[in-house]
């Protein structure tokens, strides 16, 4: 078998064997090495010398195999846009951002650029659980049978109705999707003016 060519090597068809780690240099019609993540091109290749790479300076990065002559400047997540940081910038990756709690991504351009407050779910509903937090606005779904939710909130969950018999009480009024069961002492009638959930 033929020995594998090591950059720089001539390329007649303008393609290189390893597209990830090599690139075609049209001036000399050769394939040269790209620089690994965390580095940049400090000296371009020639017919007799391969690419020379140097480490990105502090506060800058390159994420991929590249033939860039500079590193990208690290940028913080923008709190004004509702973003928070989940991981710092390193020489090999940009700052990792996500929407702050209670917010969702409202503008996406390769990555999230702007977050907005999640909509409230009205009483009797809850936000459908999503695979990824912050990906989209709330989609409110009704509480399932035997559950209630009595606030307007982006995050409140439906709770099971109180079972009066578990507390030695009897049901005075059944629960609804928006209210808990009302319980009373089995020996006492419920006065009309009292509408609390638990009456001992």
């Amino acid at each position: 078998s033929q020995p594998q060519a090591v950059p720089p090597y001539a390329s007649e068809n303008q393609t290189c064997r390893d597209q990830e780690k090599e690139y075609y240099e049209p001036q000399h019609r050769i394939c040269c090495s790209r620089c690994p993540p965390g580095t940049y091109v400090s000296a371009k290749c020639s017919r007799i010398r391969d690419t020379v790479c140097a480490t990105c300076a502090e506060n800058s990065y390159n994420e991929h195999w590249n033939y860039l002559t500079i590193c990208q400047l690290c940028r913080p997540c923008d709190p004004v846009m509702g973003l928070e940081e989940i991981a710092p910038c390193t020489s090999k990756r940009k700052t990792q951002c996500r929407c702050q709690p209670g917010m969702f991504c409202a503008a996406w351009a390769l990555e999230c650029t702007h977050c907005e407050l999640l909509s409230d779910c009205p009483p009797g509903t809850e936000a459908e659980l999503k695979d990824e937090v912050g990906k989209g606005n709330n989609h409110c779904v009704p509480c399932k049978a035997g559950h209630f939710q009595n606030t307007s909130s982006p995050s409140a969950r439906c709770q099971p109705h109180t079972r009066c018999e578990n507390q030695g009480l009897v049901e005075a009024a059944p629960g609804t999707a928006q209210s808990d069961t009302t319980c009373k002492n089995p020996l006492e009638p419920l006065p009309p003016e009292m509408s609390g959930t638990m009456l001992m």
């Epitope: 502090e58 913080p76 923008d78 940081e85 991981a87 390193t90 020489s91």
Partner: antibody
Framework: QVQLQQSGPELVKPGASVRISCKAS????????LHWVKQRPGQGLEWIGW????????QYNEKFKGKATLTADKSSSTAYMQLSSLTSEDSAIYFC?????????WGQGTTVTVSS | DIVMTQSQKFMSTSVGDRVSVTCKAS??????VAWYQQKPGQSPKSLIS???YRYSGVPDRFTGSGSGTDFTLTITNVQSEDLAEYFC?????????FGSGTKLEIK
């Protein structure tokens, strides 16, 4: 060269607050994160949070939310940490540190002693 | 939170020996690990970043290795001035977390 100069030791009463400072020099203050780290005597290191002086935004370890407040003054290149409602658990050495792939630069530490 | 475990609290060694301090992350942190040396009454001093990059001015007897979850700081030809506590730290995700430390004792 990068230097982080911290304020002197503090003796404070339980329930009180204290503010310690970290003056930066030798680099552009507004373009690097400044972190705060707690070390209790004979114990390990705990990350409190960071402040980015460029936009004066801070982010905290959940454990220290409500305990520590991080601020920065661009004009004097100084970062501050206020600790509130102090208890004996807050007696520790507090370090500021500038980050880049870890913490290459550290202040000398400020000892906070909480005692009545 | 990611837990960084340094299982050996103390390690005893002799001048000229080789010693390895280990650190295990509770989840994959890539190579985003730093090592620090702390002497009594002093601030931590940065030795290694990116798991294996040695800071300038740090003697070449200090070597870092590992990726993913298992990391090692190796000191070859131990010197008396290496008597200190050594901490690992992950900076892969917030909150940053440190190992509990390994104290190196010189016999």
């Amino acid at each position: 060269q990068v230097q982080l100069q911290q304020s002197g030791p503090e003796l404070v009463k339980p329930g009180a607050s204290v503010r310690i400072s970290c003056k930066a020099s030798g680099y552009t203050f507004t373009t690097y994160y400044l972190h705060w780290v707690k070390q209790r005597p004979g114990q390990g290191l705990e990350w409190i949070g960071w402040i980015y002086p460029g936009n004066v935004h801070a982010q905290y370890n959940e454990k220290f939310k409500g305990k520590a407040t991080l601020t920065a003054d661009k004009s004097s290149s100084t970062a501050y940490m206020q600790l509130s409602s102090l208890t004996s658990e807050d007696s520790a050495i507090y370090f500021c540190a500038r980050s880049w792939e870890g913490f290459p630069y550290w202040g000398q530490g400020t000892t906070v002693t909480v005692s009545s | 939170d990611i837990v960084m475990t340094q299982s050996q609290k103390f390690m005893s060694t002799s001048v000229g020996d080789r010693v390895s301090v280990t650190c295990k992350a509770s989840q994959n942190v890539g190579i985003n690990v730093a090592w620090y040396q702390q002497k009594p009454g002093q601030s931590p001093k940065s030795l290694i970043s990116s798991a294996s990059y040695r800071y300038s001015g740090v003697p070449d007897r200090f070597t870092g290795s590992g990726s993913g979850t298992d990391f090692t700081l190796t000191i070859t030809n131990v010197q008396s001035e290496d008597l200190a506590e050594y901490f690992c730290q992950q900076y892969d995700t917030y909150p940053f977390t440190f190992g509990s430390g390994t104290k190196l004792e010189i016999k």
